[in-house]
């Protein structure tokens, strides 16, 4: 599985777990199907994941949600790729926007993201949604992750 | 293109094709402007790729589909990116949800689906939906394939 | 950062770009939190990627917009992701349709694009949407990018 | 909580037909192969048959080859065995089982959840 000891395979792939925090960041275990290359990419605190090298990244990210027009705010469900670099602020990389549907009790839509970007070591990307207890958390339906090329 | 004769790069991109057939599994096929890098990753039965190493690959598939809320069930649209290895069950890998249009006749609407997963030798994953009638065919709408890391 | 001299690491991430112009194609910008590799990879006349090596690319887009199902065409909503090969007419790799929203003033919805192909020297990507005056250029809503495998 | 709930069975005539259901609850069903197996009276457990995750695959005991069919409605979460052709051997507490995600499909045995069962009894 190695590309040499010098540059060893680093990916990771999680999936989403629901939470009884209030925070509008989405938490993730090592569970069913995940994947966690190695040492060198960490999910920390549940929420984000950490990489230990510098180098460029396709990060991704899937969420499914449920929700309905009349229930919801008037804004859209918007999920946030973002990234928190050692010492400095946290800033968004990636977001996606779907407006709530009318189907009732919710309407179930699914986003993705992905891109790819430069990452520090030390440097941490996690995911922000607007609501989270709209997350739909069945097999497969939401996930984040990532690969160093 | 070789990384080198141990390591061949490995990536497969495959085209939709309509069918027939009523299983709700999609069939592909190499036409169009597909990939298919070498031996070491096949499309079996116009319905899987089956890959021959094991390691960690980026699998992805794109759905784009058209339906309308009162022609369809009331569950929503569902695509699932499957994984079958040998001697196992299939097992979901990733899902998208989306809930049927008001639009009519119908409303057309995509889904991509994509992941870093671990897969054995004569590993095979598939797409599965819940209405392959309503899957949109034409050039570009939906397509599927991964690529080894 | 190098996977060696001969094989350079080869990506890129660029940003959306609001535009006067009426064309369909939509412009982007090395802007924000971008990426570009190496002059391997360039964004011409800001509105295509160009490479200059042979080889198996992974090729995304992520479009977001904001429409309305009254304001706008009957038509949906479609995002093309285009190739351009020298002393070839372009063609399709990839296309995404959603349907307008009925949401006052224009509901937003995401849509993303990826998937492997083969790319001679010169050829150039480059995204087309319906209706670029829906596109929603706000921080990481749209982006489009690529990377060598 | 997992739960799964048997129903349908009862007393039938040699040669009649019987279709036992499962009402399962408390996981994301349609991500699990599940089976039938059954007890008979003073005998040992026999798995009866399989059905993959998404209703793909199907396996069954040479026994009961033929005979019956196992089928999955993920949207109403309920797995099902249409029993034809029944025989008294075929007499039984039958019992629907959940199987780990991925499971093997030569192992029968090594199931997560079973239901309380329910008896089908062939008899003229």
């Known amino acids: 599985m190695q590309k040499g000891d010098q540059n060893p395979q680093i990916a990771a792939h999680v999936i989403s777990e629901a939470s009884s925090k209030t925070t509008s960041v989405l938490q993730w275990a090592e569970k069913g199907y995940y994947t966690m290359s190695n040492n060198l990419v960490t999910l920390e605190n549940g929420k984000q994941l950490t990489v230990k090298r510098q180098g460029l990244y396709y990060i991704y990210a899937q969420v499914t949600f449920c929700s309905n027009r009349e229930a919801s705010s008037q804004a859209p469900f918007i999920a946030s790729l973002c990234l928190k670099s050692p010492g400095r602020f946290e800033r968004i990389l990636l977001r996606a926007a779907n407006t709530h549907s009318s189907a009732k009790p919710c309407g179930q839509q699914s986003i993705h993201l992905g891109g790819v970007f430069e990452l520090q070591p030390g440097a941490s990307v996690f995911v922000n949604v607007t609501d989270p207890s709209q997350v739909s958390h069945g097999t497969g339906f939401t996930s984040f992750g990532l690969l160093k090329l | 293109m070789q990384k080198g004769d141990q390591n061949p790069q490995i990536a497969a991109h495959v085209i939709s094709e309509a069918s027939s057939k009523t299983t709700s599994v999609l069939q592909w096929a190499e036409k169009g402007y597909y990939t298919m890098s070498n031996n070491l990753v096949t499309l079996e039965n116009g319905k899987q790729l089956t890959v021959k190493r094991q390691g960690l690959y980026y699998i992805y598939a794109q759905v784009t589909f058209c339906s309308n809320r009162e022609a369809s069930s009331q569950a929503p649209f569902i695509a699932s990116l499957c994984l079958k290895s040998p001697g196992r069950f299939e097992r979901i890998l990733l899902r998208a949800a989306n809930t049927h249009s008001s639009a009519k006749p119908c409303g057309q609407q995509s889904i991509h689906l994509g992941g870093v997963f671990e897969l054995q030798p004569g590993a095979s994953v598939f797409v599965n939906v819940t209405d392959p009638s309503q899957v949109s065919h034409g050039t570009g709408f939906t397509s599927f394939g991964l690529l080894k890391l | 950062m190098q996977k060696g001299d001969q094989n350079p690491q080869i990506a890129a991430h660029v940003i959306s770009e609001a535009s006067s112009k009426t064309t369909s194609v939509l412009q982007w910008a090395e802007k924000g939190y971008y990426t570009m590799s190496n002059n391997l990879v360039t964004l011409e006349n800001g509105k295509q990627l160009t490479v200059k090596r042979q080889g198996l690319y992974y090729i995304y887009a992520q479009v977001t917009f904001c429409s309305n199902r009254e304001a706008s065409s009957q038509a949906p909503f479609i995002a093309s992701l285009c190739l351009k090969s020298p002393g070839r007419f372009e063609r399709i790799l990839l296309r995404a349709a959603n349907t307008h929203s009925s949401a006052k003033p224009c509901g937003q919805q995401s849509i993303h694009l990826g998937g492997v192909f083969e790319l001679q020297p010169g050829a150039s990507v480059f995204v087309n949407v319906t209706d670029p005056s829906q596109v929603s250029h706000g921080t990481g809503f749209t982006s489009f990018g690529l990377l060598k495998l | 909580e997992v739960q799964l709930l048997e129903s349908g069975g009862g007393l039938v005539q040699p040669g009649g037909s019987l279709r036992l259901s499962c009402a399962a609850s408390?996981?994301?069903?349609?991500?699990?192969?599940m089976s039938w197996v059954r007890q008979a009276p003073g005998k040992g457990l026999e798995w009866v048959s399989s059905i993959s995750p998404l209703g793909l695959w199907t396996y069954y005991a040479d026994s009961v080859k033929g005979r019956f069919t196992i089928s999955r409605d993920n949207s109403k979460n309920t797995l099902y065995l249409q029993m034809n052709s029944l025989r008294a051997e075929d007499t039984a507490v039958y019992y629907c089982?959940?199987?780990?995600?991925?499971?093997?499909?030569?192992?029968?045995?090594?199931?997560?959840?079973w239901g309380q069962g329910t008896l089908v009894t062939v008899s003229s």
């Open positions: 089982a959940k199987l780990s995600a991925g499971a093997e499909t030569h192992v029968y045995r090594l199931f997560d959840y």
């Open positions: 408390g996981f994301t069903f349609e991500a699990y192969p």
